[in-house]
Structures are given as structure tokens and as C-alpha cells.
């Protein structure tokens, strides 16, 4: 039972529509068939779980219906998208990967992606 390395980009800027995407890549030491991916957010000395999904290798990630996250997997990479972000959601988003099956259990936690969210300026009234 060991730790594994998880890589993710240092910084991502959310789109004007409040959508941020980043890749979470893990160095799988074995042939995992069941993987759990959790996105954590650290801000103001507090860590909260943003979303989590368990998937079988080769299948799509399935988040809860009301989740703000979506994602796809390809080999040892997970492409994560977080939507509905506002400026107050700016923070460090951390990718946590667990290889659940078969044993042994492996755990890896990335260094985090700082996501910056800038609320769009409201459009000025126009006569046109």
C-alpha cells in the first residue's frame, strides 16, 4: 500500500461563463479497475469536498445529478470541468485520486490548481 503521484496544473482561469477545466493525471502503480476521484477546495483555512465520482476504467465518470462537476477519463488522466463558478469560488482546487480495486489501495493527492473566477461586468443598457 503506497502513495502515488498526482499532477495537475498550477493555475486555471475560469471562463466568463463560470466554467473551469483542468486535467488530473495520476501515475498508477498497478492495473486499477475502480478509481475514485474527489475534488477538494481549500480557501480561508477550510477544506471542503466539491464533488466526487467513482468509475470503472474505460467507463465515463458519473457524478451525482446535482454536482457542479463533469468529467471524462482516458487512461490515467481525468479531465475535470467545474461549472457555475463565481468570483467567491476562487480558491485552490485539489485532485484526490484513490485506486479502490483491486488491492492494494493507493492514494494520491495533487498540489492543487488555483482557479481564478472573475464575475463578468453587467452589460450596460443600450438603445440599439
Amino acid at each position: 500500500c503506497k502513495a502515488m503521484h498526482v499532477a495537475q496544473p498550477a493555475v486555471v482561469l475560469a471562463s466568463s461563463r463560470g466554467i473551469a477545466s483542468f486535467v488530473c493525471e495520476y501515475a498508477s502503480p498497478g492495473k486499477a479497475t475502480e478509481v475514485r476521484v474527489t475534488v477538494l477546495r481549500q480557501a480561508d483555512s477550510q477544506v471542503t469536498e466539491v464533488c466526487a465520482a467513482t468509475y470503472m476504467m474505460g467507463n465515463e465518470l458519473t457524478f451525482l445529478d446535482d454536482s457542479i462537476c463533469t468529467g471524462t477519463s482516458s487512461g490515467n488522466q481525468v479531465n475535470l470541468t467545474i461549472q457555475g463558478l463565481r468570483a467567491m469560488d476562487t480558491g485552490l482546487y485539489i485532485c484526490k485520486v484513490e485506486l479502490m480495486y483491486p488491492p492494494p489501495y493507493y492514494l494520491g493527492i495533487g498540489n492543487g490548481t488555483q482557479i481564478y473566477v472573475i464575475d463578468p461586468e453587467p452589460c450596460p443598457d443600450s438603445d440599439f
Epitope: 502515488m4 477550510q46 494520491g108 493527492i109
Partner: nanobody, 130 residues
Framework: EVQLVESGGGLVQPGGSLRLSCAAS????????LGWFRQAPGKGREAVST???????SYADSVKGRFTISRDNAKNTLYLQMNSLRPEDTAVYYC????????????????????????WGQGTLVTVSS
């Protein structure tokens, strides 16, 4: 398989001392974070103290100056020396391993820091009461 086994808990009077131990096996990663957490009845788990693989230590404000964390690498054992115990220290104490040392020093000042740890012992109960 990783195993963490805590011991040393018990009933102690206010102002007394206890030394908790956590014997670890099955974990071979060299760069990691070891921590002590506690969970009082009806409350969430909170980080008490952490120690990095390099030996840097960190403490929650509520235990600073009273608790001391240490490790014996030769014995694969983590310790928590608890002095000047108070009734509010009553809780189940857990040791844990975190795989990323980046989050080690800040854990005792961070709510929800348990998310950074993935391997847990079964816990040992500490009761401070007269």
C-alpha cells in the same frame, strides 16, 4: 496493507499527562505527513498535530505548549505526549497518514484537513475527568 494501531489512551485527571503511540506498518512512501486527529462526542474530526517526513512539526492553537508530537523512524512509531490535560481534550484520538507533504504544516490550522489524509487507525479514547 497499511495498518495504524493507536494505544495509550485512558482516563486521566485534569492537569495530568498521557502518551499516545501509533505503530505503523505496510507504508513505504518516504515523503509523507503523519498526524494526530481527535473527535469529541458529537463533533467533527480535527487535526491536533502533524509531523513531516523531515521532522517539521505543527500544532493546533488549542494544544500548543501542552502537546508534543514525535516519531521514531526505526520503530515506525508516532507519538503524542499530552501534558496539562483539560476536560475539553476528551475525545477519540486517531493517527493518520497523508501522502502529500505540501498540506502537512497547515493541517492543524485548517478545518476539514482530514480530507488530506487517507489512512487511519481505529482510535484510542482519552477521557479527562475528575
Amino acid at each position: 496493507e497499511v495498518q495504524l494501531v493507536e494505544s495509550g489512551g485512558g482516563l486521566v485527571q485534569p492537569g495530568g499527562s498521557l502518551r499516545l503511540s501509533c505503530a505503523a506498518s505496510g507504508y513505504t512512501y518516504s515523503r509523507h505527513c503523519l498526524g494526530w486527529f481527535r473527535q469529541a462526542p458529537g463533533k467533527g474530526r480535527e487535526a491536533v498535530s502533524t509531523i513531516s517526513s523531515g521532522g517539521s512539526t505543527s500544532y493546533a492553537d488549542s494544544v500548543k505548549g501542552r502537546f508534543t508530537i514525535s516519531r521514531d523512524n526505526a520503530k515506525n512509531t508516532l507519538y503524542l505526549q499530552m501534558n496539562s490535560l483539560r476536560p475539553e481534550d476528551t475525545a477519540v484520538y486517531y493517527c493518520a497518514i497523508g501522502p502529500n507533504p505540501r498540506y502537512c504544516s497547515g493541517a492543524p490550522q485548517t478545518r476539514g484537513a482530514e480530507h488530506y489524509f487517507g489512512y487511519w487507525g481505529q482510535g484510542t479514547l482519552v477521557t479527562v475527568s475528575s
